[in-house]
Interface confidence: medium
């Protein structure tokens, strides 16, 4: 009675920089005692490694065992349902989990006012799990880009979209005053990774910040 349980319908990775989470959908009609076994295969080492014997959640954080993702050929994962002595067939991720699957994020966006300009500083992610030498800028060392969406408040429309190739930028306001809200989405021009919009940061610009120079 080894394969009486149905297999998890799908298994996939959702990853950000050094935050690699495996997800799966539950088997239909699972019982309270159903749990899931997780195994991992590293490309180049053709054997499956058992990671968790009995996870009762529908996700598993694999960051600690995939720390070399950015220097490897990637991974596959598989999950099967277990209920007492019964277990299902394995469901394997249908794509290779590699650096290409990592969704790019920024740590934060800092805004300040300087001589009537809005100065923006994009802070890169600094996850605790990352090895000391594996910084975002060392792994994505070239062609980092950022889309910037600027919204003027009041009014919910996006004021403008810009693309920059640096973590610092200054916004010329040309006498515009009010609250300006900025979001940033990272990308790497030479890669196909998806990017995620940052949390919106806002700053107020008032008349007092302007000085006229001839």
């Amino acid at each position: 009675h080894g394969t009486e349980l149905p297999s998890p319908p799908s298994v996939w990775f959702e990853a950000e920089f050094f935050h690699h989470i495996l997800h799966w959908t539950p088997i239909p009609n699972q019982s309270e005692s159903t749990c899931y076994e997780v195994a991992l295969l590293r490309y180049g080492i053709e054997s499956w490694n058992s990671i968790s014997n009995c996870s009762q959640t529908l996700s598993y954080d694999l960051t600690a065992v995939t720390l070399d993702l950015y220097h490897s050929n990637g991974y596959r994962a598989r999950v099967r349902a277990v209920d007492g002595s019964r277990h299902s067939n394995w469901t394997v991720t249908n794509t290779r989990f590699s650096v290409d699957e990592v969704t790019l994020t920024v740590g934060s966006v800092n805004l300040e006012i300087h001589n009537g300009f809005i100065l923006g500083k994009i802070q890169l992610p600094r996850p605790k799990m990352a090895p000391a030498n594996d910084t975002y800028e060392s792994i994505f060392s070239h062609f980092r880009e950022y889309e910037i969406a600027i919204r003027k408040v009041p009014g919910n429309f996006t004021f403008t979209h810009k693309k920059v190739k640096h973590e610092n930028f200054s916004l010329l306001t040309s006498g515009e005053v009010g609250e300006f809200c900025v979001q940033v989405k990272p990308s790497v021009a030479s890669r196909s990774n998806k990017g995620m919009w940052s949390k919106e940061e806002c700053i107020s610009l008032t008349r007092q910040y302007f000085t006229v120079t001839n």
């Epitope: 810009k162 920059v164 610092n168 010329l172 006498g175």
Partner: nanobody, 134 residues
């Protein structure tokens, strides 16, 4: 310190064309915001056109459709192509620049239709005279 040197001014008949150039000496020119301004005798200096490091352009209403601002990052040069010139375009034309943030980066205009404001611009050239006769 950034140095700006305009050239290309001169006298032209109404309906004619000129191309102004502004040679920029300074670090990382491609990341600057650049603009053209003009000042007619007895009048305020006014913004004509500007371009940011991303290539976004902004024009004064009075020159839209007639003037084109562009830059050549390889040559560190800013241009203003002026077509269908009118006598009211007669003025001294100045090139101006805004450097990027202190620790490097890009200078950007906040919006696509932001007016060109001299309050933003930090560095100025000496100017080149344009005279349009009817």
């Amino acid at each position: 310190q950034v140095q700006l040197q305009e050239s290309g001014g001169g006298s032209v008949q109404a309906g004619g064309s000129l191309r102004l150039s502004c040679a920029v000496s300074g670090y990382a020119y491609s990341t600057y915001c650049m603009g053209w301004f003009r000042q007619a005798p007895g009048k305020e200096r006014e913004g004509v056109a500007a371009i940011d490091s991303g290539g976004s352009t902004s024009y004064a209403d009075s020159v839209k459709g007639r003037f084109t601002i562009s830059k050549d990052n390889a040559k560190n040069t800013l241009y203003l192509r002026m077509n269908s010139l009118k006598p009211e375009d007669t003025a001294m034309y100045y090139c101006a620049a805004v450097p990027p943030p202190p620790d490097g980066g890009s200078c950007l205009f906040l919006g696509p239709e932001i007016k060109v404001s001299k309050a933003d611009f930090r560095y100025w050239g000496q100017g080149t005279q344009v005279t349009v006769s009817s």
